[in-house]
């Protein structure tokens, strides 16, 4: 491979790393770029044991502008020091680096949920994965938003043990034929800027339901 | 070699606020972390919070959230910590650190600066 | 918040005597990735902090051989096998392994 004086410095690549289904996604992306590359190459080592860097197997050559590196990267603590390539053809167009701490880096992106809406209570169905790491629980909290007419009402479900597995919750005493939204998301325990999903939205049906909240639960 | 320069000494009225820095020389700023701490005399330290100058990304302690604001400035590799709504209870010496390898290891250790709240 | 422990809070010693002081937290400070972020500092009067040992037991560079850390899961140990006039302080564990970081209150080292 030649290498070309690389015209990007380490700050012409923005990363962003983001534990999306509890797994943990480096993104990047590229500022100023007059040759869009055709592929990357992520490398990275430890920097309490700085040995040679290592190439990310599943993120050699790939054309994709992100990384899965849950397998890589299970120190929360630890120093991750990074290298994006960048390559049009044979040649390195750029060489971007980065350290990362999972600890203090990480955003955490919302679950994906789904909403059932009764006469009188919703049932959230949030989906986690059915195994999660012990190490890529974050001492985080689930947050549930009810929203109706200017409302916003947080619901904190307990869930015991780890987030794995599907999670139903019930939201209820609510008022027939009323449009609710609700919004999930995963909290830190430091209250960090969170990340909201996007709201979904039921308008419940009218009329009386003869099952009871309380016996759905 | 490693130093962390601290501005000098503050004596503030409550109410104010107040930005001390920290001067990072001897290493590459951005490719290591820089905690903040407080200390009150005869007291242990108190961990208030941490920033990573190379993203920006920060976590505080939620005692001091609100209270302290942590900026980096990559050009001049200035750290900073803002205190508002000061009281007495602010009345401390603070220290900025650096975390080489892991998070909450605090390698090197600036002089500390003295605020003081007082009408 | 996870409570670290120390004592003595002060200890009277005699130079080229041996000395230790113990760091006891609320809960394990073992992290899931297999290490122990218990770490221990020196505080000079009128100084800067100076950390002498990190991950329970690594001495930091310049920190002579008498300075020996130990222990695991909550209980801790610093152990000074001779004093010298120099390590009189105030000496601090402090963990980084649970969110947020938490320091003891202190052992004074002082000269009996």
């Known amino acids: 491979i030649s290498y070309d004086s690389p015209d990007y410095t380490d700050e012409s690549c923005t990363f962003k790393i983001s534990l999306r289904n509890f797994r943990s996604i480096l993104s990047w992306e590229l500022k100023n770029h007059s040759i869009v590359p055709t592929h990357y190459t992520l490398l990275y080592t430890i920097m309490s044991k700085p040995e040679d860097l290592k190439v990310v197997k599943n993120c050699a050559n790939t054309t994709r502008s992100f990384c899965d590196l849950t397998d890589e990267w299970r120190s929360t603590h630890e120093a991750y020091v990074t290298v994006l390539e960048g390559f049009s053809g044979n040649t390195t167009l750029f060489s971007c680096s980065h350290n990362f701490w999972l600890a203090i880096d990480m955003s955490f992106e919302p679950p994906e949920f789904e909403i059932v809406g009764f006469t009188n209570h919703i049932n959230v169905m949030v989906k986690f994965p059915s195994i999660v790491e012990e190490e890529l629980q974050f001492d985080l909290s689930l947050v549930i938003e009810e929203q109706s007419e200017g409302i916003v009402k947080k619901h904190k479900p307990e869930i015991k043990g780890n987030m794995s597995g599907n999670f139903t919750y019930i939201i209820d005493k609510l008022i027939p034929n009323t449009n609710y939204c609700v919004s999930v998301y995963l909290e830190h325990s430091d209250e960090q800027a969170v990340i909201k999903s996007p709201l979904k939205c039921t308008l419940l049906p009218p009329g009386q339901e003869s099952e009871s909240a309380e016996s759905a639960k | 070699q490693v130093q962390l320069q601290q501005s000098g000494a503050e004596l503030v009225r409550p109410g104010t606020s107040v930005k001390v820095s920290c001067k990072a020389s001897g290493y590459a700023f951005t490719n290591y972390l820089i905690e903040w701490v407080k200390q009150r005399p005869g007291q242990g330290p108190e961990w208030i919070g941490v920033?990573?100058?190379?993203?920006?990304?920060?976590r505080y302690n939620g005692k001091f959230k609100g209270k302290a604001t942590l900026t980096a400035d990559k050009s001049s590799s200035t750290a900073y910590m803002q205190l508002s709504s000061l009281t007495s209870d602010d009345s401390a010496v603070y220290f900025c650190?650096?975390?080489?390898?892991?998070?909450?290891?605090?390698?090197?250790w600036g002089q500390g600066t003295s605020v003081t709240v007082s009408s | 918040d996870v409570v670290m422990t120390q004592t003595p809070l002060t200890l009277s010693v005699t130079i080229g005597q041996p000395a230790s002081i113990s760091c006891k937290s609320s809960?394990?400070?073992?992290?899931?990735?297999?290490?122990?972020?218990l770490n221990w500092l020196l505080q000079r009067p009128g100084q800067s902090p100076k950390r002498l040992i990190y991950l329970v037991s690594k001495l930091d560079s310049g920190v002579p051989d008498r300075f020996t850390g130990s222990g695991s899961g909550t209980d801790f140990t610093l152990k000074i096998s001779r004093v010298e006039a120099e390590d009189l302080g105030v000496y601090y564990c402090?963990?980084?392994?649970?969110?947020?970081?938490?320091f003891g209150g202190g052992t004074k080292l002082e000269l009996k």
């Open positions: 809960q394990s400070l073992l992290d899931s990735d297999g290490k122990t972020y």
């Open positions: 920033i990573n100058p190379g993203s920006g990304n920060i």
């Open positions: 402090w963990q980084g392994t649970h969110f947020p970081q938490t």
């Open positions: 650190a650096r975390d080489a390898y892991y998070v909450g290891a605090m390698d090197y």
